[in-house]
Interface confidence: low
């Protein structure tokens, strides 16, 4: 049987002669040269050679465990004379022994990491990893220990894990943002003679909100004319904040001062400035100076830094209102006046009043804007503002007159203002009622007495307060001996009724009825209208067949045969 132990060979042999591996030996070998040893398998005849007589194996080249740690070969022993094997072919292993010939190599040449500023000591930053190609199962050639070469006292590294942590309290980004840390990985458990590699870790402190906003000055002063409309920007204030991004966002607000209701502050999103704007109309004559307390605050506050103090700052803003020569101001925004339509020329309707609001109290003169009163129906006393008529009025022509009055400062004609005047013309009963339409009707020759042949309606241009109340009657000259009667329905209508049985169209073909229509207002107005009644031949249903004259233009009469 074969006689050998496992073969071991040290890697990276540097000797000048071949490296002895070991001896293949069969217990059948009597040492007389009758046996021949043959080697086959991994590297046989090239890397490994065998003395076929003695079985001694040598390595011809320097071997690298990291390239190939194990070689598997086969051994044969044969009888030189017969060529027959004296041992079964057997597999054996040459194991390459490790030496510490590889330094640790980091997975990255440069690491990049971030950690919030002001982090607690021991806060995780990043983990670095180095690998060593040597044999981890044998000795300490691959046992890596991490240490920090550069970056203390700010950061530390855990020797076994490569975890980098913060090592100093209160690291402030606003003081220093970037750190370059150099980490060494050393094998042999960090002992003397170990091989080492290094890597660079670039660490950036990210911002936290640890700085409040600060106004660079405690007082600001701005001026604005009293004429500034609401929304007008007056000035800009800016607080600075050493933080960045959303931690540097600033919100401005007015927290106190007499101008609290008069002014606003808007945050300009782009510039992070506070824009002071006018909120309500200013009046130099009422108040010339306002003082505001404006606050700048961080909307995104981190509770853990509240101990550093309030994340806000205040400044005083003084606003000086500048005087502007203002136009006169009317006592009302608009005036509504009324006058009867029968008013005589020069009748006073009412008056307007305007005053210069400035301290000078310049006198004012009044005038009518003639573009709004082209017909010069009204006039105004330039001194006292009294409005009076200069022409006769007619409500039925125009109910409302809309005119504009101008008030002008006598000493400064450029300063003027305008006010609308709405003048309502009140109704007077100055129009008579009249027929609503032209009435022409017919009566059948065989009509019976008291038949309704036409209903009358009236209209009136006036507009009495309690509504129209018309009365209808035959004119006095036609009332006696008339062939028809008028029946007043007391509802502003009246009916024409036949007064006799039968009409002869050959005797009288047409009747003209004068009807008096009166209103019941003061003074009473009345008019006379004429109704034409034609006598016609009718069928037994009372339908008109023929009349003495031409065919009726308006056959509006009611059937009388019924």
């Amino acid at each position: 049987s074969w006689m050998w132990n496992q073969f071991f060979l040290l890697e990276e042999y540097t000797g000048s002669d071949y490296q002895y591996v070991g001896k293949l030996h069969s217990d059948q070998d009597r040492g007389d040269g009758s046996l021949k040893y043959i080697l086959s398998g991994d590297g046989a005849g090239d890397l490994f050679i065998i003395n076929e007589n003695t079985g001694d194996i040598q390595a011809t080249k320097r071997l690298d465990r990291e390239e190939k740690p194990v070689y598997i070969l086969r051994a044969q022993a044969i009888n030189r004379r017969t060529g027959r094997p004296v041992e079964p072919e057997s597999e054996f292993i040459i194991k390459i022994h490790d030496i510490n010939d590889n330094e640790p190599i980091f997975t990255k040449e440069v690491y990049t990491a971030t950690v919030p500023e002001m982090s607690d000591v021991g806060t995780f930053v990043v983990q670095v990893t180095a690998t060593d190609a040597d044999d981890p199962t044998y000795g300490n050639s691959a046992k890596v220990v991490y240490s920090i070469l550069q970056g203390q006292p700010y950061f530390s590294v855990e020797s076994e894990t490569g975890i980098i942590k913060t090592a100093l309290l209160n690291m402030d980004r606003e003081n220093r943002e970037q750190y370059q840390v150099v980490i060494q990985a050393k094998d042999m458990g960090g002992q003397m003679g170990g091989l080492s590699g290094t890597t660079t870790v670039n660490i950036t402190l990210t911002d936290v909100n640890d700085n409040p906003p600060r106004f660079p000055q405690s007082t600001y002063q701005f001026k604005t004319p009293e004429s500034s409309p609401p929304g007008t920007p007056i000035g800009r204030i800016k607080a600075s904040d050493a933080d960045v991004g959303e931690n540097a966002e600033i919100e401005y607000s007015i927290t106190d001062g007499e101008g609290l209701d008069m002014f606003d502050v808007i945050t300009d999103q782009e510039t992070q400035e506070g824009i002071i704007t006018v909120k309500k109309l200013l009046d130099f004559e009422k108040k010339k100076v306002y003082t505001l307390k404006v606050e700048a605050s961080n909307p995104h506050v981190e509770p853990r830094f509240l101990y550093l103090g309030p994340f806000k700052d205040s400044a005083t803003v003084r606003i000086v209102v500048e005087d502007v020569d203002e136009p006169p101001v009317f006592s009302k925004l608009a005036y509504i006046l009324q006058i009867r339509e029968d008013a005589q020329i020069n009748t006073t309707i009412g008056s307007v009043t305007a005053q210069d609001p400035d301290a000078a109290r310049n006198p004012v003169k009044y005038s009518v804007d003639r573009h709004t009163d082209m017909d010069r129906i009204f006039n105004i006393d330039s001194g006292n503002g009294s409005i009076f008529t200069s022409k006769l009025l007619d409500r039925e022509t125009l109910l409302w007159h809309n005119i504009t009055v101008i008030a002008t400062e006598i000493n400064n004609p450029k300063q003027s203002s305008r006010v609308p005047l709405y003048i309502k013309v009140l109704d007077v009963n100055d129009n008579a009622p009249e027929f609503a339409e032209f009435y022409e009707t017919f009566v059948c020759e065989k009509a019976k007495a008291d038949q309704l042949i036409q209903t009358l309606r009236a209209v009136d241009k006036d507009d009495p307060y309690s509504g129209h109340q018309f009365s209808f009657s035959l004119a006095p000259e036609a009332a006696s001996g008339s062939n028809f009667t008028i029946q007043d329905n007391k509802d502003n209508t009246a009916g024409i009724l036949t007064r006799k049985n039968g009409y002869n169209r050959h005797e009288m073909s047409t009747y003209l009825l004068p009807v008096v229509i009166s209103d019941n207002d003061y003074p009473v107005q009345s008019s006379t209208g004429t109704v034409t009644v034609r006598v016609c031949a009718c069928d037994h249903h009372g339908n008109m067949q023929s009349c003495h004259a031409e065919a009726l233009i308006h056959p509006t009469g009611l059937s009388t045969g019924a």
């Epitope: 960045v244 991004g245 959303e246 966002e249 919100e251 945050t267 999103q269 909307p299």
Partner: antibody, heavy 120, light 106 residues
Framework: QVQLVESGGGLVKPGGSLRLSCAAS????????ISWVRQAPGKGLEWVGF??????????NYAAPVKGRFTISRDDSKNTLYLQMNSLKTEDTAVYYC???????????WGQGTLVTVSS | DIQMTQSPSSLSASVGDRVTITCRAS??????LNWYQQKPGKAPKLLIY???NLQSGVPSRFSGSGSGTDFTLTISSLQPEDFATYYC????????FGQGTKVEIK
């Protein structure tokens, strides 16, 4: 003037992927956080996710229904925002808007939207 | 997650009417409440931010109020162009929207 223009929408099968873009102009793009918002047909608005600015470390945050499937990125040199949508589901069908996030956590400018339809 | 509940979900009103929409948060949101208007086929438009601040260019008939959990959007005199859907949005803890209020013509 400020403008946001979305593109890249279209029809995709369930399980598929799509990449939306949002091109910005008229403002300093790199200084602003930008959000993606979506609106399913006939439904209300739903926040998808956002990416902060360079000054805030390009932090991203996502709504629960899309976390792990959608990724927001940006290229400040091109003034462009991206939304990479993977493992799409039928319930992701919506008009997708990008919107500029202003201070005080409101969205002052929006794009016109791009329609994404997920259907087999 | 913070839930936002808007009421009513829809309302009918006439031009000139005063309209009020309310929004309630499931927990306090420190005034980080925004209101948006959206018209069909269009992107939402910011009206009010931080509960009561009028966005630049928005008519003054729109106003917002409230703090903590209860907020209100008021349109003092409804105009024809105001018929739209209105959404509230909280920005205190990530973002969530109300379900919307549709303002229709009566």
């Amino acid at each position: 003037q400020v403008q946001l223009v979305e593109s890249g929408g279209g029809l995709v099968k369930p399980g598929g992927s799509l990449r939306l873009s949002c091109a910005a102009s008229g403002f300093t793009f790199s200084s602003y956080a930008i959000s993606w918002v979506r609106q399913a047909p006939g439904k209300g608005l739903e926040w998808v996710g956002f990416i902060k600015s360079n000054a805030d470390g390009y932090t991203t945050n996502y709504a629960a229904p899309v976390k792990g499937r959608f990724t927001i990125s940006r290229d400040d040199s091109k003034n462009t925002l991206y939304l990479q949508m993977n493992s799409l589901k039928t319930e992701d069908t919506a008009v997708y808007y990008c919107a500029r996030i202003r201070y005080f956590r409101n969205w002052d400018y929006w794009g016109q939207g791009t329609l994404v339809t997920v259907s087999s | 997650d913070i839930q936002m509940t808007q009421s009513p979900s829809s309302l009918s009103a006439s031009v000139g009417d005063r309209v009020t929409i309310t929004c309630r948060a499931s927990q306090t949101i420190n005034s980080y409440l925004n209101w948006y208007q959206q018209k069909p086929g269009k992107a939402p438009k910011l009206l009010i931010y931080r509960a009561s601040n009028l966005q630049s260019g928005v008519p003054s008939r729109f106003s917002g109020s409230g703090s903590g959990t209860d907020f209100t959007l008021t349109i003092s005199s409804l105009q024809p162009e105001d018929f739209a859907t209105y959404y509230c949005q909280q920005g205190d803890s990530s973002w969530t929207f109300g379900q919307g209020t549709k303002v229709e013509i009566k």
